[in-house]
Amino acid sequence: QGWQAFKNDATEIIPELGEYPEPPPELENNKTMNRAENGGRPPHHPFETKDVSEYSCRELHFTRYVTDGQCRSAKPVTELVCSGQCGPARLLPNAIGRGKWWRPSGPDFRCIPDRYRAQRVQLLCPGGAAPRARKVRLVASCKCKRLTRFHNQSELKDFGPEAARPQKGRKPRPRARGAKANQAELENAY
């Protein structure tokens, strides 16, 4: 469970461990937002190739405000979404290449969060209540993770202690502000 155990209401764009996010539509073809591919590091993959651009584990940056119940962060935070499959583009399924990519009895490589960072944010709440702070867990970098066809999804949950997502330590929040409300705010933040 790790960080999963802490409900991170304001980072609902970050998937549960074992899930793989797709960037919001606005980001998909927005090259200006894609400041770093593979985090500037050689991609983790099993294929021999001289053209790194053929590999599609991308780190897409976007900015959003953190919401927590009726409160909102004073400043926006910038975080990453890991996007794409991990393999040469020519080997990916046709079209967009978001489908599961299996080789017969071979491994599957997925683009998933590699490292996380926690950022403390000050929250502005109605009524001038006591100063409040919250820590949000943000993806710091992405990597390709091998998953053989014989492994289940839990094999992906190898993020180590940092994966423990203290999402719990937050203040109560009205049900009305669910994933969709936060998603809408996120989309308005670009």
């Epitope: 403390r120 203290p166 009205p174």
Partner: antibody, heavy 118, light 107 residues
Framework: QVQLVQSGAEVKKPGASVKVSCKVS????????MHWVRQAPGKGLEWMGW????????EYASKFQGRVTMTEDTSTDTAYMELSSLRSEDTAVYYC???????????WGQGTLVTVSS | DIQMTQSPSSLSASVGDRVTITCRAS??????LAWYQQKPGKAPKLLIY???TLESGVPSRFSGSGSGTDFTLTISSLQPEDFATYYC?????????FGGGTKVEIK
């Protein structure tokens, strides 16, 4: 699995100090806030304060100001709460609790009974 | 300090009963209220936060409502494992304070 494991029970004399430890596992200590809450025998819960292990920031309840010190050893993911000038009314179970905000308590340690008696 | 007053302080109920516990704040706390369950010899467990948001893993028979000064915790159909003491806690103003607790006993 997020776990908080606290140190064992303590018996102290009035005027002495006690230091309770809270070892966390399953996540990185600096990614959360650490809270301390106490409960006198048969009584309710009382918030003592919180600390931010990442930067050493803290907020103590005014009732404990000057007597309580909350620290962390981030290399071992262990938090500490020291209470000085103990008196009999400090006899209580002391809990560490963690969360990603300063205002609610998501995971709790099992508690440490501190008995202050002459 | 904000005083949190729970009522009743104790109640007796049977399995299957609908149970309601109230918590009143001495001043408005918006919806910054959490509910905890504590069993004898154990640490409290978070049930609800932001007055009405169910903590992950908590059964849906638990629900919370209210805003401002008056809040309610409801257990729609009491189960054997629900016999415990329940505390409300305000997270709006320092120092954070708890209610005195409501002990739910078997009738």
């Amino acid at each position: 699995q997020v776990q908080l494991v606290q140190s064992g029970a303590e018996v102290k004399k009035p005027g002495a100090s006690v230091k309770v430890s809270c070892k966390v596992s399953g996540y990185t200590l600096t990614h959360t806030f650490m809270h301390w809450v106490r409960q006198a025998p048969g009584k309710g819960l009382e918030w003592m304060g919180w600390s931010d292990p990442e930067i050493g920031d803290h907020e103590y309840a005014s009732k404990f100001q000057g007597r309580v010190t909350m620290t962390e050893d981030t290399s071992t993911d262990t938090a500490y709460m020291e209470l000085s000038s103990l008196r009999s009314e400090d006899t209580a179970v002391y809990y560490c609790a963690t969360g990603d905000t300063t205002y609610k308590f998501d995971y709790w340690g099992q508690g440490t009974l501190v008995t202050v008696s002459s | 300090d904000i005083q949190m007053t729970q009522s009743p302080s104790s109640l007796s109920a049977s399995v299957g009963d609908r149970v309601t516990i109230t918590c009143r704040a001495s001043e408005g706390i918006h919806d910054a209220l959490a509910w905890y369950q504590q069993k004898p010899g154990k640490a409290p467990k978070l049930l609800i936060y932001w007055a009405s948001t169910l903590e992950s893993g908590v059964p849906s028979r638990f629900s919370g409502s209210g805003s401002g000064t008056d809040f309610t915790l409801t257990i729609s159909s009491l189960q054997p494992e629900d016999f415990a003491t329940y505390y409300c806690q305000q997270g709006d103003t320092l120092p954070y304070t708890f209610g005195g607790g409501t002990k739910v006993e078997i009738k």
